[in-house]
């Protein structure tokens, strides 16, 4: 049954919203998809979760959620926000998750985000953001996950990322980024997942991934790369790499020499004609290798040290004979 305290909590539930105790004597409040044009006024001070997504909220006043010191998650996705003023999140000392996706923001709300020291997850995807100010994330020392996909970025906001040393996952997919400069992510030593797919990336700085010492997943699919991304060679912990649907014509010798932990490589839908014979050596974790239409391959790839392949597909090549060692190299 419900305790007397939960009854008191539920009396602080805004009209038409759905409320329930969160099991810690705090309140989860769901006011989503109610056609609201402004924030509810009679929120309980004990609210820990507030979902205001899929409404018609077009503006936030400064300090619109006073006294919600226990609020940990605020969802404002799918509204009509074009601007968030300074002070919009004042007093939200416990805020860990902030969802602002699917709005009409043109800039990262720098001033509003300042001092959200507990924030761990920030969703800014599906807005119209074209500019990320250099200091916009400077106070977000706990941030672990950042979504900036599906915006209008044309370049990597290099300086803005410098303060995010705790960041573990980030997506910059579905933007208009055309180049990644050297040390673009130089301070993101905790980053494990980086999504850059569906951009217009045609060139990578030789050292563009330097500093990403924890990176395990890199997604460069659906870009305009003409050359193999040799910058991956410093990613010693990389497990999953995607660069399918680009314009890469060759995979060089020793292509993955710095990536011995690779389990998965997706590179289909590239006009690959040449593959260096040593390209896939020393990849003990690799399970699947598919090379379709590489017409300039005349020798079977040297798979020394790549002993756990479960599936190998080679089509359209010019290989006339198999080496005697091929059955020794494969399981």
């Amino acid at each position: 049954g419900s305790s007397p305290r939960s009854g008191v909590l539920l009396r602080g539930c805004p009209t038409h919203c759905h409320c329930e105790p969160d099991g810690r004597m705090l309140l989860r409040v769901d006011c989503s998809d109610l056609g609201l044009s402004e924030l509810p006024s009679n929120l309980s001070v004990f609210t820990s979760y507030l979902d205001l997504s899929m409404n018609n909220i077009s503006q936030l006043l400064p300090n619109p959620l006073p006294s919600l010191r226990f609020l940990e998650e605020l969802r404002l996705a799918g509204n009509a926000l074009t601007y968030i003023p300074k002070g919009a999140f004042t007093g939200l000392y416990s805020l860990k998750v902030l969802m602002l996706q699917n709005n009409q923001l043109r800039h990262v709300p720098t001033e509003a985000l300042q001092n959200l020291r507990s924030l761990q997850s920030l969703r800014l995807d599906a807005n119209h953001i074209s500019y990320v100010p250099p200091s916009c994330f400077s106070g977000l020392h706990s941030l672990r996950h950042l979504w900036l996909d599906d915006n209008a970025l044309t370049e990597i906001p290099v300086q803005a990322f410098r303060s995010l040393s705790a960041l573990q996952a980030m997506t910059l997919a579905l933007n208009k980024i055309h180049h990644i400069p050297d040390y673009a992510f130089g301070n993101l030593s905790s980053l494990v997942v980086l999504h850059l797919h569906n951009n217009r990336i045609h060139s990578l700085g030789k050292k563009c991934f330097d500093g990403l010492h924890s990176l395990e997943t890199l997604d460069l699919n659906y870009n305009n790369l003409d050359e193999f991304p040799t910058a991956i060679r410093t990613l010693s912990n990389l497990k999953e790499l995607g660069f399918h649907s680009n314009n890469i014509r060759s995979i060089p010798e020793k292509a993955f020499v710095g990536n011995p932990s690779l389990i998965t490589i997706h590179f289909y839908d590239n006009p690959i004609q040449f593959v260096g014979r040593s390209a896939f050596q020393h990849l003990p974790e690799l399970r699947t290798l598919t090379l379709n239409g590489a017409s300039q391959i005349t020798e079977f790839p040297d798979l020394t040290g790549t002993a756990n392949l479960e599936s190998l597909t080679l089509t359209g090549a010019q290989i006339s004979s198999l080496p005697q060692t091929v059955c020794n190299q494969l399981p």
Epitope: P134, E155, R162, P181, Y183, D210
Partner: antibody, heavy 118, light 111 residues
């Protein structure tokens, strides 16, 4: 902890070649560039070039392209610089250093002194 | 090549006072908001030691009396207050563009 240990002093004759080694410990060898720097009294510090260990990725200062060749051995975590056709001007202290945060040189070897003398 | 001009060539500073060293680049070393300028300290018979990276970021383990500032072409290393152990030669270095280049050095003596 990170350490770069270089080979000892070399005394060579003009026209000869020398190979200086730099053994790295305490970090993932293939994840950082190794830079080579020359220091001569009165000439300050000169960047010779860099190599990403284990790969064929190298970059040379145009001035040293003919003089220097870099190589690496991942089995022993060692990088090498070979200097050929030695002249008196090659007499110097040669340092290896790790390219760290944003390419700054965060760890240095102790230096290898090369003396070219007939 | 980018030329780095350091001044002064030498500097005598009293204990507890401030030492200021300048480094001017022949062209900007800024890229995407980062200044690719670094500072090193070298004592006789030792390799250089990194003090400051990206113009103003203190390397781990370096005392807070060292600070760096500047952008584009003009950079400054400041030691305040100077201690006896700071007697050394200080170099700036850019890695904005190949070939990476160093300044000619500033020798700091303690009075």
């Amino acid at each position: 902890q990170v350490q770069l240990q270089q080979s000892g002093t070399e005394l060579m004759k003009p026209g000869a070649s020398v190979k200086i080694s730099c053994k790295a410990t305490g970090y993932t060898f293939s994840a950082y560039w190794i830079e080579w720097i020359k220091q001569r009294p009165g000439h300050g510090l000169e960047w010779i070039g860099e190599i990403l260990p284990g790969s064929d990725s190298t970059d040379y200062n145009e001035k040293f392209k003919v003089k220097a060749t870099f190589s690496s051995d991942t089995s022993s975590n060692t990088v090498y610089i070979q200097l050929n056709s030695l002249t008196y001007e090659d007499s110097a202290v040669y340092y290896c250093a790790r390219g760290g945060h944003y390419g700054s040189l965060d760890y240095w070897g102790q230096g290898t002194t090369l003396k070219v003398s007939s | 090549n980018i030329v780095l001009t350091q001044s002064p060539a030498s500097l005598a500073v009293s204990l507890g006072q401030r030492a200021t060293i300048s480094c001017r680049a022949s062209e900007s070393v800024d890229n995407y908001g980062n200044s690719f300028m670094h500072w090193y300290q070298q004592k006789p018979g030792q390799p250089p030691k990194l003090l400051i990276y990206l113009a103003s970021n203190l390397e781990s383990g370096v005392p807070a009396r060292f600070s760096g500032s500047g952008s584009r072409t003009d950079f400054t290393l400041t030691i305040d207050p100077v201690e006896a152990d700071d007697a050394a030669t200080y170099y700036c270095q850019q890695n904005y563009e190949d070939p990476f280049t160093f300044g000619s050095g500033t020798k700091v003596e303690i009075k």
